[in-house]
């Protein structure tokens, strides 16, 4: 009874289609599958960025797999053929591993790459990225930003740079159609007549870097002799009400500071008859139902009440 063996996949490689970190891992079937033509061969693929503790593992019947990687580091991957137990009358048979690596040959020393890259998706509408030039680079150095997300045919270059002293130090992006809830890839590379410039790669999801506008139309409503309801409206723009968390800062008579985080556009405050002055501000942030992270908005304009009017039904600024 001869031992059943199977070859590893052929032509295993990592292909960079120019999407700034979204790579294709692809391979060809192993040779000599003649004993198993009635059987679906599977492949176990393992891959990671070099330096990562853990491998990502995929089992697939396909001859390709796509995923995002950090191109600031190298990538390593390995794959072998699996014959399920149904094909071999008992135990699963595995081939030896085929292995491959991929990295972008780095140009320039690390200090030449952009510093303090910061990207904010203002009000879920306008993406703006800014950076500082690399350490010790000359004024002739210019940086260029390229970006890609699934849905674009190819990586695009920024067309509206923010400049300082003739150098590009940021990018105002155009309208980005259907770009949220997917990886957004950025490469900032550079050129200088003096020395090579190191490229930098960044990946994030736009919904996680949203900075909303502050809430508007802050009002007071007397609910009872000892309760005041603070109300406000969601900021104008595309973010639905269900996506907001709010932080309120309330000052009573310039002394007591109350801070609270709420999910709705109202907050009920217990007050005493002695309260002479009440002020509050609100800021907003995209909540966990709509993103994994976010940036607090600026504080709203302050809304204050002073004097005897606190007993009246509604107080508007």
């Amino acid at each position: 009874d001869t031992e059943i063996k199977v070859n590893p996949p052929q032509d295993f490689e990592i292909v960079d289609p120019g999407y700034l970190g979204y790579l294709y891992l692809q391979w060809q079937p192993p040779l000599s599958l003649d004993h198993f033509k009635e059987c679906t061969v599977e492949y176990e693929l393992k891959y990671r960025n070099i330096g990562s503790e853990t491998w990502k593992t995929i089992i697939t019947k396909n001859l390709h797999y796509k995923d995002g990687f950090d191109l600031n580091k190298g990538i390593e991957a390995k794959i072998h053929t699996l014959l399920p137990w149904q094909c071999t009358n008992g135990s699963e048979v595995q081939s030896s591993w085929a292995e491959t690596t991929y990295w972008i040959s780095p140009q320039g020393i690390p200090e030449t790459k952009v510093q303090d890259m910061d990207c904010v998706y203002y009000n879920w509408q306008y993406l703006l990225c800014s950076w500082k030039p690399g350490i010790g680079v000359l004024l002739d150095t210019n940086y260029n930003l390229f970006y890609w997300y699934e849905g674009l045919d190819h990586a695009l270059q920024c067309v509206d740079y923010i400049k300082a002293d003739g150098q590009n130090i940021g990018c105002r992006f155009p309208y980005l159609e259907a770009s949220d809830y997917k990886d957004f890839y950025i490469c900032v590379n550079g050129s200088s007549e003096n020395k090579p410039i190191r490229s930098s790669y960044f990946t994030f999801q736009l919904q996680n870097i949203v900075k909303p506008l502050p809430p508007v139309y802050l009002t007071f409503t007397r609910e009872s002799s000892c309760e005041i309801k603070l109300k406000w409206s969601i900021p104008l723009g595309p973010i639905p009400a269900r996506c907001f968390d709010y932080e309120i800062e309330i000052r009573e008579d310039d002394t007591t500071l109350v801070t609270a985080t709420v999910e709705n556009e109202t907050y009920t405050l217990k007050t005493t008859n002695e309260t002479r002055q009440l002020c509050f501000v609100v800021r907003s942030k995209v909540n966990i139902y709509c993103s994994d992270d976010g940036i607090w908005s600026e504080w709203s304009d302050k809304q204050c009440w002073e004097g005897e009017d606190l007993s009246k039904k509604t107080l508007l600024r």
């Epitope: 490689e13 294709y24 000599s32 390709h64």
Partner: antibody
Framework: QVKLVESGAEVVKPGASVKLSCKAS????????MSWVRQAPGQRLEWVAT????????YYPESVKGRFTITRDNSTSTLYLEMRSLRSDDTAVYYC???????????WGQGTLVTVSS | DVVMTQSPLSLPVTLGQPASISCKAS??????VAWFQQRPGQSPRRLIY???YRYSGVPDRFSGSGSGTDFTLKISRVEAEDVGVYYC?????????FGQGTKLEIK
């Protein structure tokens, strides 16, 4: 739709070099291996070279190894075949072909005639 | 190298009648065999892969069979547009090799 368009006909002298190109469209070029196949007048098809999708792997028959080089430029979706030290028996129509995901050749270009003659 | 031997080399067929082409490999090539049609003055066109699977767009009168070393291409009812040379090819091992071709013509 998938389209493969080879460069124009070439007439060269024995010992000379020539570089053929094949422009691909209608599919994700970097995901597919590509091959060159030739056909001498009145003869069977003869495989000349294969390159994997990312260009990491190349294969040649003994008859052209060391003389022919297959390359690709995935940024322009173009396949190349550089032929050096050409001989009269290299005279043929050269086809580029896409390798499908089972390793067969599923789409072929229109062919380009290379004539090696003194 | 794997030698692919086709027979017959010439195949005269009456319109509407069936046709069969044989291809024998000099060693086991599993089911890694493809069939191509080359009409006069044209590039080869894909017909069959993995010995028996028809590519999309190929009329169902074409069928392939076989595994190991013996393979067959059948045309159930020959039509005028089927005239040309038919090639088998193995892609089980490098170098890739083709049969010498079978010329199908109408009687």
């Amino acid at each position: 739709q998938v389209k493969l368009v080879e460069s124009g006909a070439e007439v060269v002298k024995p010992g000379a070099s020539v570089k053929l190109s094949c422009k691909a469209s209608g599919f994700t070029f970097s995901s597919y291996g590509m091959s060159w196949v030739r056909q001498a007048p009145g003869q069977r098809l003869e495989w000349v070279a294969t390159i994997s999708g990312g260009g990491s792997y190349t294969y040649y028959p003994e008859s052209v190894k060391g003389r022919f080089t297959i390359t690709r430029d995935n940024s322009t979706s173009t396949l190349y075949l550089e032929m050096r030290s050409l001989r009269s028996d290299d005279t043929a129509v050269y086809y580029c072909a896409r390798r499908d995901l089972r390793s067969a050749m599923d789409y072929w270009g229109q062919g380009t005639l290379v004539t090696v003659s003194s | 190298d794997v030698v692919m031997t086709q027979s017959p080399l010439s195949l005269p067929v009456t319109l509407g009648q069936p046709a069969s082409i044989s291809c024998k490999a000099s060693q086991n090539v599993d089911i890694n065999v493809a069939w191509f049609q080359q009409r006069p003055g044209q590039s080869p066109r894909r017909l069959i892969y993995s010995a028996s699977y028809r590519y999309s767009g190929v009329p169902d009168r074409f069928s392939g069979s076989g595994s190991g070393t013996d393979f067959t291409l059948k045309i159930s009812r020959v039509e005028a547009e089927d005239v040309g040379v038919y090639y088998c090819q193995q892609y089980n091992a490098y170098p890739l090799t083709f049969g010498q071709g079978t010329k199908l013509e109408i009687k």
